[in-house]
């Protein structure tokens, strides 16, 4: 009992501490940590039925999607899927959880963000962190050496997300990957072309795709004097250059990661450079970098890549950026990341900062990690950060006060007089059977005004009105909701007339 009282006091004190920190506007990380402590204390306290007030909410970092948000999401997915299919991709799916062993050692410093599941009868399981590692596992398991596939599914990360910026703990990824032995840089160029096609089609604003190569990074670190064991950790520091100044990055590398200041300065001379193919040419002439085998290979491939990107007509969207050092351990060659240059916002509004909206790269060693003989299957791919894109599209539509239809109903079957429910049911059934998207109000005798109002609200373009006289004449009154114009259509021609007016193909193929 004394222990419970002590815990209750600690919960109270910790609650006061959290409130105090919020009032003092302490750092977000400190508040987050103290809130996490409070939750752990409460968990130890366990339920006290007399006090327990269950707050109905979704777990941290997750959200529900309203019909309006789903409509936006489906439009975005449609653009992406059509592009993937246009490029000849097949589709696969994999389990939402994998054996923990499958995911271990693939994500470097990000491994701490993997969700582990509680005991599942002996198997140690984790929720998938991305779609790439499961894809590599799928290739190795099925002994596939050649596939072009896309996969759209939810992934899970135990992050501390800023949900306002389109970041979550459960979120969709849309991945496109090409696996197989091909001539250099052709699949890589196609991935960048796909990325640009999708981002252009979505009309979310001007974007830039930053490109680098893991081999150039590794070669650069080697000639600057970074020990092999520090490559990955220094990479994660360099990758922060898009968010913080070089000074801060240098301080982290020297102060926290134990790098000598002169080594950091040498790295700084390289990683602060960005440009186009001319920068590639310049670095090929660099007396130190050109002597490094890895860097030389990477630069040679990038030169070739820029040739193909020019042929694809997207070289103006690409920037060779030496600070790009994507955090995942499995990249081996070209890496890329698309960022929005500015996000559309109302005049006088703060632009929505959403960072990276797509990313990817080459990972030639990942499949080999799963193969007992270490056989490699070269792979290159991209991932579209759709959650961030949803946030931008939603914000844009809100700013424009644009009405989004959340259903696809083409026609409402209505009646002008009482006692016509049976006739409405018969007609709506005929329309459904003919492939027409139709609805009716679930009332025996609805008022015509209410039925028309329902169409206005739901954005239904047409109303098929049944009346006593129309039944005798064998016609249906077809009314346009927006123009209010009405025409009598012979019952047998109704399906064809609705399809004509809504632009639907005349046969359901």
């Amino acid at each position: 009992m004394a222990e419970r009282a002590a815990l209750e006091e600690l919960v109270k004190l910790q609650g006061e501490r959290v409130r105090g920190l919020k009032q003092q506007k302490a750092s977000a990380e400190l508040i987050e940590e103290e809130v996490a402590k409070l939750l752990k204390l409460k968990a130890q306290l366990g339920p006290d039925e007399s006090k327990q007030k269950f707050v109905l909410k979704t777990p941290k970092g997750t959200r529900d999607y309203s019909p309006r948000q789903m409509a936006v999401r489906e439009k975005v997915f449609d653009v992406i899927i059509r592009c993937f299919k246009r490029h000849g991709a097949e589709v696969i799916d994999t389990p939402v959880f994998e054996l923990k062993e499958t995911l271990m050692g693939k994500y470097g410093e990000d491994s701490k963000l993997i969700y582990d599941l509680k005991d599942q009868g002996g198997e140690l399981l984790s929720l998938r962190y991305d779609l790439t590692v499961p894809f590599a596992r799928y290739l190795a398991m099925n002994k596939l050496t050649n596939i072009k596939r896309y996969h759209i599914a939810k992934v899970y990360r135990r992050d501390n997300p800023a949900m306002t910026r389109g970041r979550y703990r459960e979120f969709y990824q849309c991945d496109f990957d090409i696996a197989g032995n091909f001539d250099p840089m052709i699949p890589d160029a196609e991935c960048l072309k796909i990325m640009c096609e999708i981002l252009s089609s979505l009309q979310i604003g001007d974007f830039l795709v930053k490109v680098n190569d893991r081999r150039i990074l590794d070669g650069m670190f080697a000639i600057c004097g970074v020990s092999d064991s520090k490559f990955r950790t220094i990479c994660s520091s360099v990758d922060k250059l898009d968010k913080v100044s070089w000074e801060e990055v240098k301080n982290e590398m020297v102060g926290e990661k134990g790098l000598a200041p002169e080594v950091a300065d040498r790295i700084g001379d390289y990683v602060q450079q960005h440009g186009g193919v001319s920068l590639v040419e310049q670095l090929l002439q660099d007396p130190k970098l050109s002597q490094n085998k890895q860097a030389l290979e990477g630069l040679g491939d990038l030169k070739l890549l820029f040739e193909y990107l020019t042929l694809f007509g997207i070289d103006d969207k690409i920037s060779f950026d030496l600070s790009l050092a994507r955090g995942l351990d499995y990249y081996t060659g070209v890496i890329y990341e698309a960022v929005l240059l500015q996000t559309p916002a109302q005049a006088g509004e703060e632009p929505l900062g959403v960072g990276s909206v797509a990313a990817g790269g080459r990972y030639d060693g990942l499949v080999g990690m799963f193969d007992p003989k270490g056989r490699k299957v070269p792979c290159v791919g991209l991932s579209i950060g759709v959650e961030r894109i949803f946030s931008i599209v939603e914000q844009r539509l809100e700013a424009l006060e644009e009405k989004i239809r959340t259903t696809e109903t083409q026609v409402l079957v209505a009646s002008a007089q009482k006692k016509l429910l049976e006739e409405r049911l018969k007609l709506v059934s005929e329309l459904w059977d003919a492939g027409i998207k139709a609805e009716l109000l679930y009332k025996k005798n609805p008022k015509l005004l209410n039925q028309l109002q329902y169409c206005e609200e739901a954005g239904i373009p047409l109303v098929a009105i049944i009346g006593e006289q129309e039944l005798k004449d064998g016609v249906i009154k077809l009314r346009s909701v927006t123009s209010r114009e009405e025409v009598d259509v012979r019952r047998e021609d109704l399906v064809e007339e609705i399809k004509r007016r809504t632009g639907q193909p005349l046969c359901i193929c």
Epitope: L10, A36, K112, R158
Partner: antibody, heavy 120, light 107 residues
Amino acid sequence: QVQLVESGGGLVKPGGSLRLSCAASGFTFSDYYMSWIRQAPGKGLEWVSYISDSSTYTNYTDSVRGRFTISRDNAKNSLYLQMNSLRAEDTAVYYCARYLYQVIAVADSWGQGTLVTVSS
Amino acid sequence: DIQMTQSPSSVSASVGDRVTITCRASQGISSWLAWFQQKPGKAPKLLIYVASNLESGVPSRFSGSGSGTDFTLTISSLQPEDFATYYCQQANSFPYTFGQGTKLEIK
């Protein structure tokens, strides 16, 4: 019962490195914040560093920040302190300690300590 | 950083005496204060946390009080095993700091 056993101490020259380990048993290690606390010979106690249950949060006292790194391996029930660029003033008995009620910054269980001597 | 100042730095007392040690924080720390006992060559032992809560297994002759900046540890009737050094520690904000210690000696 709760047991914390430190190891890895010893004599090291200034500028050198040492890695301290702490083996934990008798409790669910992965539920607890853990810390390193030191005591220079004949002196008071100094809280050096802490790490949260799943390694999300770490912190260091100013005098060691950038030189020491705290880490843990929950699968092995182990806590570590990597000490680089050691100085004479780092000479102390280093204690591994467990947080009270998992998250309260009060050490309710301590190891026996391991002596680190930095001297040329 | 929050400074913790203990007084007295040493105290001589006899078995059966009532002893009070005080600890002052350089800024308000609510009730985030703990008291430890340390004997030579041993690790410290937790006596009291959040100013007044007795750690399980600690004799009831030990008690703590205070909040904000001023705190006291009281031993109501000294026993032979109580002769040791006592430290206070603030757990309000990092870096968590200890007092310089109060040595309790036999008179």
